[in-house]
């Protein structure tokens, strides 16, 4: 399973799924343009499964208020896209297995290299 490769525009919703991972425990994001959101390079956790059944989302991350689980676990997520979200989303399993989704957000390569806001939460019209 090569994983997903999804295209979308700011303001659209995309579904991220955890294909081939038996017990998903967390999602990790490696941004293509980290500086666009004022971040450093590398992977960062964006969501964990929790025993309460409600996934844990770190408070200081770019997807707060835009990412939600579509099922009782964290196998399927819905993300409301924003400029700068381009990157690779990894679904990590309990047994070290993982799946990946490569996301390309329309205009990111241009928008994220332009001077201006680094948070990327509002897409210029």
């Amino acid at each position: 399973n090569p994983g997903a490769s999804l295209d979308g525009r700011p303001g659209d919703r995309v579904n991220l799924s955890c294909g081939g991972v038996s017990h998903p425990i967390r999602w990790v994001w490696a941004p293509s343009f980290p500086a666009c959101k004022g971040l450093s390079k590398g992977r960062r956790p964006i969501l964990w499964a929790s025993s309460s059944g409600t996934p844990t989302v770190p408070p200081l991350q770019p997807f707060v208020g835009r990412l939600r689980s579509l099922d009782s676990g964290i196998r399927r997520l819905e993300l409301l896209l924003s400029a700068g979200d381009s990157g690779t989303f990894f679904c990590k399993g309990r047994h070290e297995d993982e799946s990946r989704t490569v996301l390309h957000v329309l205009g990111d390569r241009t928008y994220c290299k332009a001077p201006g806001p680094t948070h990327g939460s509002v897409y210029p019209q």
Epitope: A4, L6, R13, N15, L106
Partner: antibody, heavy 119, light 107 residues
Framework: EVQLQQSGAELVKPGASVKLSCTAS????????IHWVKQRPEQGLEWIGR????????RYDPKFQGKATITADTSSNSAYLQVSSLTSEDTAVYYC????????????WGQGTSVTVSS | DIQMTQTTSSLSASLGDRVTISCRAS??????LNWYQQKPDGTVKLLIY???TLHSGVPSRFSGSGSGTDYSLTISNLEQEDVATYFC?????????FGGGTKLEIK
């Protein structure tokens, strides 16, 4: 009204290159992905690739890598497909089309451009 | 690459019939499945996107369903203007791929 107007039919010699154009009206290509699709005579549809016109970010089916080049000119609201080193296998109708992304399919298509490779 | 298979390459039905065209993906495509209609003159139109959402202007007699690897397009009340070839396409991963098509004719 959304329209994609493609250039006219081409008759080209083996080994040559051809550049097809697709001019959009009714929308700004910078706000969509532009795709190119190939259809050989009496065959199905083959996805060649797509471009994000705002940043010239192109992706291709590996079998068309090096054979096809997709470009865009946002000032003229147009996209282009160049096919090089033409052989009889490249004889086909080529469609340009637009998409808002993976969730939405390819929602509007051009009328197609027929390319015939013959000596 | 993900292979998309339309096992029926052609079918014939009567006006007013309910027709179902099926499509199978070589792996789970998470509902990123679209259907297109190509008329005999070559014109291509999107009918349904994301498995079951009707594109604007498409008659409600067209519907789509499915999940995982198996998907279908249904025409509930066949009309003469539905004579065409129908293609499925996955948008789950690059390269996007199409099924081989199902040619629909009127008996």
């Amino acid at each position: 009204e959304v329209q994609l107007q493609q250039s006219g039919a081409e008759l080209v010699k083996p080994g040559a290159s051809v550049k097809l154009s697709c001019t959009a009206s009714g929308f700004n290509i910078k706000e969509t992905y532009i795709h190119w699709v190939k259809q050989r005579p009496e065959q199905g549809l083959e996805w060649i690739g797509r471009i994000d016109p705002a940043d010239v970010y192109g992706r291709y089916d590996p079998k068309f890598q090096g054979k096809a080049t997709i470009t865009a000119d946002t000032s003229s609201n147009s996209a282009y497909l160049q096919v090089s080193s033409l052989t009889s296998e490249d004889t086909a109708v080529y469609y340009c089309a637009r998409s808002y992304g993976s969730s939405y399919g390819i929602d509007y298509w051009g009328q197609g451009t027929s390319v015939t490779v013959s000596s | 690459d993900i292979q998309m298979t339309q096992t029926t390459s052609s079918l014939s039905a009567s006006l007013g019939d309910r027709v179902t065209i099926s499509c199978r993906a070589s792996q789970d495509i998470s509902n990123y499945l679209n259907w297109y209609q190509q008329k005999p003159d070559g014109t291509v139109k999107l009918l349904i996107y994301y498995t079951s959402t009707l594109h604007s202007g498409v008659p409600s007699r067209f519907s789509g369903s499915g999940s995982g690897t198996d998907y279908s397009l249904t025409i509930s009340n066949l009309e003469q203007e539905d004579v065409a070839t129908y293609f499925c396409q996955q948008g789950y991963t690059l390269p996007w791929t199409f099924g081989g098509g199902t040619k629909l004719e009127i008996k």
